[in-house]
């Protein structure tokens, strides 16, 4: 069956956000896939998704984010933009209302992002094949 | 693939205009910012404008301020510099680079050559 | 206005050398210095981000240092296609500048 085309924005995205890494992309979230082990795949990507809204809604307004100029501060508006249509986009292919996100491990965004884009691309290989 | 091209560069009197254009393709457009970079012969780069291409916003170098504009056309994926009353001091390859997602310059057109002489 | 001053402006270097490049800026522009190769008649390339960081596809060999207003690139083993000219660049704040250059010359 054909891949969805949310599947394909999501990867998309993650291609750009590991592109390059910033000051708050080293910051730590909570690491939902140190133990997914007994999680369905619709759980993985709703905490997923909950777990960047956790981050964006703490950081957006971060001044260790923003900085002190203005191209420091359209970086993060990007981060903050990209992680938000992330998201957006897992929510879509989640189609859950709400998910727990208990785990005590933590990980830089940076390796969460990566982690999530093997995970998504992982996916596409199977869907596309 | 990313690709950027670069377009109506040439020979041009003092005082004169010339409008560049820079035809970005494989990726979205408005993801990324947009800058002109240009360097005179046998001299370095020199930063010329910056553009957000999500709201619109430009920033340009004090030399070139209030006779260069850029612009977008988002539905050609284009940006556009109009350079006005042009000097011998403009001549020089100018580049359309894309800023990288969050750092620096990572892609490049290939330039075009603006020659200003009378 | 931030200055970006390079040095040296040229070296000359065989294969195999280490080369160290150096980059001051006028005022501190934190972390946020870029590091690009240009070779004749082609359009720069971005090496180095956000100070160390390597661009996609850089080689190993490549690696930046520093901070505030002074920064490094060394290439810990130069080969034939690495001679070129590189140039610092900051964007920390508008204008962005780059420093003059410097050119990679076979001794």
């Known amino acids: 069956h054909k891949c969805d085309i949310t599947l394909q924005e999501i990867i998309k995205t993650l291609n750009s956000l590991t592109e390059q890494k910033t000051l708050c992309t080293e910051l730590t979230v909570t690491d939902i896939f140190a133990a997914s082990k007994n999680t369905t795949e619709k759980e993985t990507f709703c905490r997923a998704a909950t777990v960047l809204r956790q981050f964006y809604s703490h950081h957006e307004k971060d001044t260790r984010c923003l900085g002190a100029t203005a191209q420091q501060f359209h970086r993060h508006k990007q981060l903050i933009r990209f992680l938000k249509r992330l998201d957006r986009n897992l929510w879509g292919l989640a189609g859950l209302n709400s998910c727990p996100v208990k785990e005590a491990n933590q990980s830089t965004l940076e390796n969460f992002l990566e982690r999530l884009k093997t995970i998504m691309r992982e996916k596409y290989s199977k869907c596309s094949s | 693939e990313v690709q950027l091209v670069e377009s109506g560069g040439g020979l041009v009197q003092p005082g004169g205009s010339l409008r560049l254009s820079c035809a970005a393709s494989g990726y979205t457009f408005t993801d990324y910012s947009m800058h002109w970079v240009r360097q005179a012969p046998g001299k370095g780069l020199e930063w010329v404008v910056w553009?957000?291409?999500?709201?619109?916003?430009?920033t340009y170098a004090d030399s070139v301020k209030g006779r260069f504009t850029i612009s977008l056309d988002n539905s050609k994926n284009t940006a556009y510099l109009q350079m006005n009353s042009l000097r011998a001091e403009d001549t020089a390859v100018y580049y359309c680079?894309?800023?990288?997602?969050?750092?620096?310059?990572?892609?490049w057109g290939q330039g075009t050559l603006v020659t200003v002489s009378s | 206005d931030i200055q970006m001053t390079q040095s040296p402006s040229s070296l000359s270097a065989s294969v195999g050398d280490r080369v160290t490049i150096t980059c001051k800026a006028s005022?501190?522009?934190?972390?946020?210095a870029a590091w690009y190769q240009q070779k004749p008649g082609k359009a720069p390339k971005l090496l180095i981000y956000?100070?160390?960081h390597r661009y996609t596809g850089v080689p190993s060999r490549f690696s930046g240092s520093g901070s505030g207003t002074d920064f490094t690139l060394t290439i810990s083993s130069l080969q034939p296609e690495d001679f070129a000219t590189y140039y610092c660049?900051?964007?920390?704040?508008?204008?962005?500048?780059f420093g003059q250059g410097t050119k990679v010359e076979i001794k």
């Open positions: 005022q501190s522009v934190i972390n946020d």
């Open positions: 553009i957000n291409t999500e709201t619109g916003e430009p």
């Open positions: 956000y100070t160390s």
């Open positions: 680079a894309r800023g990288g997602i969050f750092y620096g310059m990572d892609y």
């Open positions: 660049q900051q964007d920390y704040t508008s204008p962005w500048t």
